[in-house]
Amino acid sequence: LPGVGLTPSAAQTARQHPKMHLAHSTLKPAAHLIGDPSKQNSLLWRANTDRAFLQDGFSLSNNSLLVPTSGIYFVYSQVVFSGKAYSPKATSSPLYLAHEVQLFSSQYPFHVPLLSSQKMVYPGLQEPWLHSMYHGAAFQLTQGDQLSTHTDGIPHLVLSPSTVFFGAFAL
Amino acid sequence: LPGVGLTPSAAQTARQHPKMHLAHSTLKPAAHLIGDPSKQNSLLWRANTDRAFLQDGFSLSNNSLLVPTSGIYFVYSQVVFSGKAYSPKATSSPLYLAHEVQLFSSQYPFHVPLLSSQKMVYPGLQEPWLHSMYHGAAFQLTQGDQLSTHTDGIPHLVLSPSTVFFGAFAL
Amino acid sequence: LPGVGLTPSAAQTARQHPKMHLAHSTLKPAAHLIGDPSKQNSLLWRANTDRAFLQDGFSLSNNSLLVPTSGIYFVYSQVVFSGKAYSPKATSSPLYLAHEVQLFSSQYPFHVPLLSSQKMVYPGLQEPWLHSMYHGAAFQLTQGDQLSTHTDGIPHLVLSPSTVFFGAFAL
């Protein structure tokens, strides 16, 4: 399963269909980003590939989602980590893995954690290893708010469109 | 907690109340399916039992959800796995558990992974063992798209209405 | 990451901005609750702090969310557990961790599990340990229904606004 995605041409075809609306609904801001698989030691979000999209005002700037209009949003993210046999050398101590969605707002000058998931894995005891983390919740956000992520364990990410993603939609 | 659900009669009562609408909202396509607990070595989705439902155009065909109208949908699924080590042989090799939501579309003739979660468990190391996987995200889907799941580790599923489920709703 | 939240004054500032609406949307019932970090051996949900809120009819009574109007709701919850084994005695028996969202309805006089996640951890084998559980799904709910949670492993909860939460919103 890891690393399975669309071929570039198929992905392009997928993106070329016109913006699709539900007949009975006005558009609402929504975004779904995927981790860039070409960047192995960082987590860079991409919106112009595979199943990723930005709709109705959402934009991606400095690796952060910019909230287009005030309201309640459901915000979510997933990461999958993996590791191989013999990757730790002279330690049996665990590896700390964490993923957090953070809010930076004009209202207070620091990053506020909105969603946090954490795990200790023991590479020396269990190899190979794989671990998935997902979280999502509803938050009151203000126009101009910035949503970003912080990850501990980036070198261990399994970067594919279906395993590492970050998104939000207005309710 | 595993396996706890409604008695058949209570579940039936629960389903008999008329379709409920929010006064201030038009209906939108939504579905919530649960894994059939009577099928131990396969994962068959059911919509006509317990808290499961299909609404406003969603249908279930060939174990896949059929997307009733083009638009953005939030798609989600959960599985819970459990096991007990049956022999010392189990100690040496890990068990690969994975759950994936896949899209089959007229646009390209293969299954595209939308959501993937994965885990290695070491039955000989930790017995009994239990593991939960959840994921969900927003996707642009087209009328007629088919949403299905693929699971590695089906014999280890804890099949109850609250532990193994699959759903989607239009935004 | 664990335990990181807003200072009380910043949190208060955050709550004081007027209720924010999406220009193109009517308000819909929504709630996001966080676990009270001052209560170490119980899980008490709070709505009047940090990023938590109750909107458009949702209320919190007896540690349960009261559904304000009939319809389909997306219901979600997360917990993070942590621990450290202090003695070799911990090696022999696993710790059962579980988190469940339950429904209590006038339609049948018992708690129905809606969402369940479970995990066995082996403290003596792997210390320190950290584990996150998340789940969410769409359910047809009736006005007056009560949504509550049940957790096994409460003393091990990492109680912070971004790690332990419970919410719902109308679709």
Epitope: N41, K89, T91, Q118, G124, L125, G153, P155 | T91 | -
Partner: antibody, heavy 114, light 113 residues
Framework: EVQLVESGGGLVQPGGSLRLSCAAS????????IEWVRQAPGKGLEWVGE????????NYNEEFKGRATFSADNSKNTAYLQMNSLRAEDTAVYYC???????WGQGTLVTVSS | DIQMTQSPSSLSASVGDRVTITCKSS????????????LAWYQQKPGKAPKLLIY???TRDSGVPSRFSGSGSGTDFTLTISSLQPEDFATYYC?????????FGQGTKVEIK
């Protein structure tokens, strides 16, 4: 390449305190434990303890509990060892190490003397 | 605590000699589930930091010459230098990372004969 650089050593009076720093580079710091090991002049290696910078979890050698405190600043990729109530027998070269990658710093000498 | 005992404490050898250092632990360092021994060997030269040579009892670290090898399981371990070179004169330490606190052997000093 993983690199660890210690600093902060020097001459301290008995009963005094010292904070040693271990600056890491060449890898993502927060997920991997930093261990502290010391070596008295002409003696062997002694494990003081370790910290997980991301989680803040620590493991101490009982012999140092109460006198040694580990901390970390993830934004600076730096781990710290605070030693209190120092005595002459704490005179040693203090090393930080990352066992996951098998890397050690060059060490910093702490001399406790009046 | 697990006690680590190295022998000999020191030895004299010539360039080209085969050198063997042993390390005994007071309890097994073998983790039965994955059949790995939680033991490392370090080399230390005067005024320098220890350098990792071997981990998991027998895995050579990258860049370590093939003349260094580790063997053994459970409580008895050996570091072998198949043909001693001038740059190998140093002190060698074994370390267990099976349990807390991590502990080292007292060291074996390899000197020029």
């Amino acid at each position: 390449e993983v690199q660890l650089v210690e600093s902060g050593g020097g001459l301290v009076q008995p009963g005094g305190s010292l904070r040693l720093s271990c600056a890491a580079s060449g890898y993502t710091f927060s997920s991997y434990w930093i261990e502290w090991v010391r070596q008295a002049p002409g003696k062997g290696l002694e494990w003081v303890g370790e910290i997980s910078p991301g989680s803040g979890s620590t493991n101490y050698n009982e012999e140092f509990k109460g006198r040694a405190t580990f901390s970390a600043d993830n934004s600076k990729n730096t781990a710290y060892l605070q030693m209190n109530s120092l005595r002459a027998e704490d005179t040693a070269v203090y090393y930080c190490a990352d066992g996951y990658h098998g890397a050690w710093g060059q060490g910093t000498l702490v001399t406790v003397s009046s | 605590d697990i006690q680590m005992t190295q022998s000999p404490s020191s030895l004299s050898a010539s360039v080209g000699d085969r050198v063997t250092i042993t390390c005994k632990s007071s309890q097994s360092l073998l983790y039965s589930t994955n059949q790995k021994n939680f033991l490392a060997w370090y080399q230390q030269k005067p005024g320098k930091a220890p350098k990792l040579l071997i981990y998991w009892a027998s895995t050579r670290d990258s860049g370590v010459p093939s003349r260094f090898s580790g063997s053994g399981s459970g409580t008895d371990f050996t570091l072998t230098i198949s043909s001693l070179q001038p740059e190998d004169f140093a002190t060698y330490y074994c370390q267990q990372y099976y349990s807390y606190p991590r502990t080292f052997g007292q060291g074996t000093k390899v000197e020029i004969k």
